[in-house]
């Protein structure tokens, strides 16, 4: 019995659902009562899901798997794995037994996009040409391990004096911290590129350093110039710092975080005490670092509604403030492609190809192209609809007249994460059915 699975690994984003395709060719007169189907982990032989005695025996894998019961009779033995985790990565074997027996293994490659890197400088004031500074680039919650590259303003790679560390959290997602030590010239731009090798996603940030004397006077409050980009559901740090003078004590400090536009109080520290979160109990300061001038705010379990500008007010004897922007993002799922009509297609037929990608933020950019990468701009209709959490589902429809054969690709781009998700369909010249029959 020939059992067919994809040659390439199935790539699934953490938290999304994945389909492990498996198919066989049922003979005439085949009934489900004859079918024994077992999915198991290839290495450990742990049972994942099974179908026997004409019945779905259910999930043996954390209740996160399902078959496609309506499609089994046509030979579709695919497995749906829900809410993918890093720990799911690996090989799954599909065993099919009717009268004969066959099996094949499919690989699941788990991935998660890295956040836009945040950059910090140490020291971060009174910088002069010739000073050595440490630039730290941090990017969070990605998988698998990242590749980190540094370059200057001309794009020239910076490979000396770089130390990169990657640490996995309890979910197996990596936080990457890369440190570049440089001696300052008259001025310079330093860029950190964090690449997810599986998603082929590049996240980058830059810092331009112009050494000069800091002005004296009011409290100088420093925040990042670029928006802080945070993935929905993760934690974000809104960085804010000031320079305490000698003899400074926390009893002198008044720190207030508020929403810039509405002036809604978010968090405060006054009278030597943390007054706590006034923002849905999802904020925290870094109490151990306040005395060193670190007034940063931690925002937990970021939601789309959190997007916007936050102002950090610092008052000691003098007063200063600065606003930092929070840009919320969520990666789009790999697009699914459907054809209408999807049977007996011939050159000259008009077909409607629909590309759907889910639960991203902000709104996506959608591009269509042919097999040569030539953009297809005519007869495209794209709609985007936000759900209750503010995440967008995108549906793009392309109408084309079939040539002898052709590949049509849909690219869904998250402009903030610089994440490209794509799906393709290849239509051949002969009369055909989509999806191709096993």
């Amino acid at each position: 019995l020939e059992v067919q699975v994809p040659e390439d690994p199935v790539v699934a984003l953490v938290g999304t659902d994945a389909t492990l395709c498996c198919s066989f060719s049922p003979e005439p007169g085949f009934s489900l009562a004859q079918l024994n189907l077992i999915w198991q982990l290839t290495d450990t032989k742990q049972l994942v899901h099974s179908f026997a005695e004409g019945q779905d025996q259910g999930s043996a894998y954390a209740n996160r798997t399902a078959l496609f019961p309506d499609l089994l009779a046509q030979g579709n033995a695919s497995l749906r794995l829900q809410r993918v985790r890093v720990a799911d990565e690996g090989s799954f074997t599909c065993f099919v037994s009717i009268r004969d027996f066959g099996s094949a293994a499919v690989s699941l490659q788990v991935a998660a996009p890295y956040s836009k890197p945040s950059m910090t400088l140490e020291p971060n004031k009174d910088l002069r040409p010739g000073d050595t500074v440490t630039i730290t680039c941090s990017s969070y919650q990605g998988y698998p391990e990242a590749e980190v590259f540094w370059q200057d303003g001309q794009g020239v790679p910076l490979t000396g004096n770089v130390t990169t560390s990657q640490m996995a959290n309890e979910q197996g997602l990596f936080d990457v911290h890369s440190i570049l030590r440089v001696v300052l010239g008259a001025n310079g731009t330093y860029s950190c590129l964090v690449r997810n090798p599986v998603l082929q996603q590049d996240a980058h940030s830059s810092v331009t350093i112009t050494p000069q004397r800091s002005p004296t006077g009011a409290v100088e409050v420093q925040v990042p110039e670029d928006p802080v980009v945070a993935l929905v559901g993760t934690d974000a740090t809104l960085r804010c710092s000031f320079s305490p003078e000698p003899g400074f004590s926390l009893a002198q400090l008044n720190l207030i975080w508020q929403l810039t536009d509405t002036k809604q109080l978010v968090h405060s520290f006054t009278e030597g005490r943390d007054q706590g979160s006034a923002y849905a109990n999802r904020t925290a300061l870094f109490p151990d670092l306040l005395a060193q001038g670190n007034a940063s705010l931690r925002l937990q379990r970021v939601r789309v509604a959190d997007e916007g500008s936050f102002t950090c007010f610092v008052s000691i004897r003098d007063f200063g403030s600065a606003a930092v922007s929070l840009q919320v993002a969520a990666p789009y799922s790999k697009p699914s492609m459907t054809l209408e009509p999807n049977k007996d297609l011939r050159p000259g037929d008009t077909v409607t190809i629909t590309c759907s990608s889910y639960r991203g933020y902000p709104e996506a950019e959608v591009f269509w192209q042919d097999g040569q990468g030539v953009p297809l701009t005519g007869n495209v209709t794209t709609s985007q609809m936000a759900n209750e959490q503010g995440l967008f589902d995108v549906h793009s429809v392309l109408r084309v007249v079939l040539g002898a054969n052709g590949t049509y690709s849909c690219l869904v781009r998250n402009p903030v994460l610089q994440q490209d998700a794509h799906g393709s369909v290849t239509i051949t010249g002969q009369p055909m059915t989509f999806p191709p029959e096993a």
């Epitope: 303003g153 001309q154 790679p157 490979t159 731009t189 590129l193 690449r195 082929q200």
Partner: antibody
Framework: EVQLQQSGPELVKPGASVKISCKTS????????MHWVKQSHGKSLEWIGV????????TYNQKFKGKATLTVDKSSSTAYMELRSLTSEDSAVYYC???????????????WGQGTTLTVSS | QIVLTQSPALMSASPGEKVTMTCSAS?????MYWYQQKPRSSPKPWIY???NLASGVPARFSGSGSGTSYSLTISSMEAEDAATYYC?????????FGAGTKLELK
């Protein structure tokens, strides 16, 4: 459509200098760096250096320091390369080339000028 | 600087034949890039980030490799593939090219 239009062929005497231009169109000049590449007759490609039109920052291949000077004119979206103290070894085709992206790992040159042929001869 | 050594320097292939050329780096590089150049023309980007085909490149081309060893493969040679192919790296400064592999039609 992105285009890099280089100046025409040059025949110069040894010891002289020459300035080759690369006029760009079809994209925002300051958003991409510009590289220069040398190809001697029947030979491989050699990287000369790169300039960031946004701030004029340059990086040169050590081999071409003192030989080549890269400049830009933002108002006309044109990049220039001046070659000085010319010898017969400098006879070659010189290309300007734009990389796909500055802030991604796409470090390939996806647009090239048509090349400027320089002949150094007495 | 990182030296890229391409081999063979010259090769010929018949239509339909499988072709493989290599590019060896003197030190490890993160990614390799390939260009195709035909006589009296500028180089064209062919493969980027080791294995991705540039726009318009036929699917019979593929790229692979890691570390110090990279290759470009044509699954089935066609007449239009006759050209010189150069590899390039910029993982380390200065940017360098290989000496090229000239592919001729047999």
């Amino acid at each position: 459509e992105v285009q890099l239009q280089q100046s025409g062929p040059e025949l110069v005497k040894p010891g002289a200098s020459v300035k080759i231009s690369c006029k760009t169109s079809g994209y925002t000049f300051t958003e991409y760096t510009m590289h220069w590449v040398k190809q001697s007759h029947g030979k491989s490609l050699e990287w000369i250096g790169v300039i960031n039109p946004n701030n004029g920052g340059t990086t040169y291949n050590q081999k071409f320091k003192g030989k080549a000077t890269l400049t830009v004119d933002k108002s006309s979206s044109t990049a220039y390369m001046e070659l000085r103290s010319l010898t017969s070894e400098d006879s070659a085709v010189y290309y300007c080339a734009r990389p796909h992206s500055l802030l991604r790992l796409r470090r390939e040159f996806d647009y090239w000028g048509q090349g400027t042929t320089l002949t150094v001869s007495s | 600087q990182i030296v890229l050594t391409q081999s063979p320097a010259l090769m010929s292939a018949s239509p339909g034949e499988k072709v493989t050329m290599t590019c060896s780096a003197s030190s490890s590089v993160s990614y390799m890039y390939w260009y195709q150049q035909k006589p009296r023309s500028s180089p064209k980007p062919w493969i980027y980030l080791t294995s991705n085909l540039a726009s318009g490149v036929p699917a019979r081309f593929s790229g692979s490799g890691s570390g110090t060893s990279y290759s470009l493969t044509i699954s089935s040679m066609e007449a239009e593939d006759a050209a010189t192919y150069y590899c390039q790296q910029w993982s380390s400064n200065p940017l360098t090219f290989g000496a090229g592999t000239k592919l001729e039609l047999k």
